[in-house]
Amino acid sequence: NFMYSKTVKRLSKLQEYQQYYPSLTCVMEGKDMEDWSCCPTPWTSFQSSCYFISTVMQSWTKSQNNCSVMGADLVVINTKEEQDFITQNLKINSAYFLGLSDPKGWRHWQWVDQTPYNKNVTFWHSGEPNSPDERCAIINFRSEEWGWNDVHCHVPQKSICKMKKIYI
């Protein structure tokens, strides 16, 4: 009976999400393997988040709006492990917008989701950021490693969206 009611709840939750995400990929987790954590298909998952790489070339503001429409934000990178996971799926000759910007050019960097900007957990390439006119951040491959660079916000780039996993 308990299992039946849990299944019914799950199905109704799935139907609720179906209007936003036509297809979800879910995995069982939790100590009794009773919880399902889901990401929209074909997003990838890492820890408690889902990631989508957009190959559409757009400005930073349009890229963020595009993520927002999908219930996400441009990616906020919190750890080196998270960055290493994300970069596995990136092309080394491309650049991708992050959810990091400095709109006034005062070198006051801010994450789109209001996560505090911690200088000690940043992965800028050597010598970056280097221009107050370059107010948006990308991740790209340079000098044999992935890192961040400040660029003009209006210049179209690919982007990475991030959202919390859906639990059902």
């Epitope: 503001t61 709109p103 221009s131 006119d133 107010r135 948006c136 209006h154 210049v155």
Partner: antibody, heavy 121, light 111 residues
């Protein structure tokens, strides 16, 4: 006082080439992105090309891509526009303009007086 | 590309009265509190001159009879009271995304 002075315009036959120059003074030229904007006779403004302050970034509309090249010489405080394979529809006054960044975008705060390019056989 | 449509194409206003020019973008040129539309004035035989940046900020040295407002896709330039020296063509411009684009212009004359 900020000054932008364009030169190099003139009459050229279709298929010909011209090189426009813009001499900048009164500001630290190397710190600013610059653009060329044109205005056909009796028409509106059309952006032609942009170059970033350190010249790492250049951008063109499809209408001139592959024919026009923007460049700069920060040591000479000069901006250039090399125009090849000119067409009748390139006839316009060409302005150089200084870019100022504002939040996620930019505007043009100073413009030169313009130089006239006429493409005609 | 973002298309900017200005209206009207021209308008005649009496001296001392209010002139209102509209600019509509084909998609939003705002992001949160940043409204990324700018306005220029061009008098015959002269280059454009910046009047307003960021939808509502008056450029230094521009008389305060010029004002701008708007957000997202709809923006307005207002001149009040109109003076004889305001006879010109006015252009809106966006650069939130390359390529930067201009409106087609609005010619302001004295009635």
């Amino acid at each position: 006082e900020v000054q932008l002075v364009e030169s190099g315009g003139g009459l050229v036959k279709p298929g010909g080439s011209l090189r426009l120059s813009c001499a900048a003074s009164g500001f630290t030229f190397s710190s600013y992105g610059m653009s060329w904007v044109r205005q056909a006779p009796g028409k509106g403004l059309e952006w032609v090309s942009t170059i970033s302050s350190g010249d790492s970034y250049t951008y063109y509309p499809d209408s001139v891509k592959g024919r026009f090249t923007i460049s700069r010489d920060n040591a000479k405080n000069s901006l250039y526009l090399q125009m090849n394979s000119l067409r009748a529809e390139d006839t316009a006054v060409y302005y150089c303009a200084r870019q100022i960044y504002y939040d996620y975008a930019y505007y043009f705060d100073f413009w030169g007086q313009g130089t006239t390019v006429t493409v005609s056989s | 590309d973002i298309v900017l449509t200005q209206s009207p194409d021209s308008l005649a206003v009496s001296l001392g009265e209010r002139a209102t020019i509209n600019c509509r973008a084909s998609e939003s040129v705002s992001f949160r509190t940043s409204h990324l539309m700018h306005w220029y004035q061009q008098k015959p035989g002269q280059p454009p001159k910046l009047l307003i940046y960021g939808a509502s900020n008056l450029e230094s040295g521009v008389p305060d009879r010029f004002s701008g407002s708007g957000s997202e896709t709809d923006f307005t330039l207002t001149i009040s009271p109109l003076q004889a020296e305001d006879v010109a063509v006015y252009f809106c411009q966006q650069s939130i995304e390359d390529p930067p684009t201009f409106g087609g212009g609005t010619k302001v004359e004295i009635k």
